[in-house]
Amino acid sequence: GSMGPVIRQGPVNQTVAVDGTFVLSCVATGSPVPTILWRKDGVLVSTQDSRIKQLENGVLQIRYAKLGDTGRYTCIASTPSGEATWSAYIEVQ
């Protein structure tokens, strides 16, 4: 059957250095395995940007951090039964 997702470990607030690489993690359980999407300030994060890598294990990696990467990032874990969200604020300086 289908079971609503639960985020076991979500992203954490952090301050990161400009030009560095930082990650946002989102470990979720559910049935079937939840789909993970990321939004920044409400807008879907595009992995078309070569700086942004969707790694395994629900990890979003952002290379060459820019001041414009500052914002609230939300992990959305979804299954047919529903969705769960977890947000964190990232400041690039």
Epitope: A17, T21, R63, Y64
Partner: antibody, heavy 120, light 107 residues
Framework: QLVESGGGVVQPGGSLKLSCAAS????????MSWVRQTPDKRLELVAT????????YYPDSVKGRFTSSRDNAKNILYLQMSSLKSEDTAMYYC???????????????WGQGTSVTVSS | DIQMTQSPASLSASVGETVTITCGAS??????LTWYQRKQGKSPQLLIY???NLADDKSSRFSGSGSGRQYSLKISSLHPDDVATYYC?????????FGSGTKLEIK
């Protein structure tokens, strides 16, 4: 193929510019890195640069002293090193960042290295 | 910064044996770990990426495993050609720190 040049002996406070000539692949589509191996055999990433040269990263140990750049028309990667210290003594390698799925950072081609000695 | 602790610093084994090198991270690196092999007088070579994925041209005698903070590299049926120093590298967040290396020798 990656071939580094420009190493040598330099006094503390001095400068040196390393070059890395690339061939055999489409240089302009790859991010590149500089890694050094210190006399005690430790490895340290000292610079990364993206494919178009618009973004760079340096660890705190070299930030403000080292600058990486590239000339995609000539297929050459550079590392300008200034205010050199004795702890910068190392073998310097240029390396190509692999295009992998999943997209983990890994270096799949390395040059033969060029030696830099900072000594008075 | 994420610290990488590699052990042992050196080991000696006989041809045909299986050896394991371990690498510990100071925090969870979610499988973002790379292994390199550096033979004497040569440049490093990519061996394993993403903790478990074997680089294209490498022997299947090499295998990577682990998750969270603990990772290992196993070399099965040791060959004389495996004499080298092996390094792990954190590739989750910068600085992308390397372990201090494990020097493998043949008895």
């Amino acid at each position: 193929q990656l071939v580094e040049s420009g190493g040598g002996v330099v006094q503390p406070g001095g400068s040196l510019k390393l070059s890395c000539a690339a061939s055999g692949f489409t240089f302009s589509t790859y991010d590149m890195s500089w890694v050094r191996q210190t006399p005690d055999k430790r490895l340290e990433l000292v610079a990364t640069i993206n494919s178009n040269g618009g973004s760079t990263y340096y660890p705190d140990s070299v930030k403000g002293r080292f600058t990486s750049s590239r000339d995609n028309a000539k297929n050459i990667l550079y590392l300008q090193m200034s205010s050199l210290k004795s702890e910068d003594t190392a073998m310097y390698y240029c390396a190509r960042e692999a295009l992998l799925r999943p997209a983990y950072y890994a270096l799949d081609y390395w040059g033969q290295g060029t030696s830099v000695t900072v000594s008075s | 910064d994420i610290q990488m602790t590699q052990s042992p610093a050196s080991l000696s084994a006989s041809v045909g044996e299986t050896v394991t090198i371990t690498c510990g991270a100071s925090e969870n690196i979610y499988g973002a770990l790379t292994w390199y092999q550096r033979k004497q007088g040569k440049s490093p070579q990519l061996l394993i990426y993403g903790a478990i994925n074997l680089a294209d041209d490498k022997s299947s005698r090499f295998s990577g495993s682990g998750s969270g903070r603990q990772y290992s590299l196993k070399i099965s049926s040791l060959h004389p050609d495996d004499v080298a120093t092996y390094y792990c590298q954190n590739v989750l967040s910068t600085p992308f720190t390397f372990g201090s290396g494990t020097k493998l020798e043949i008895k």
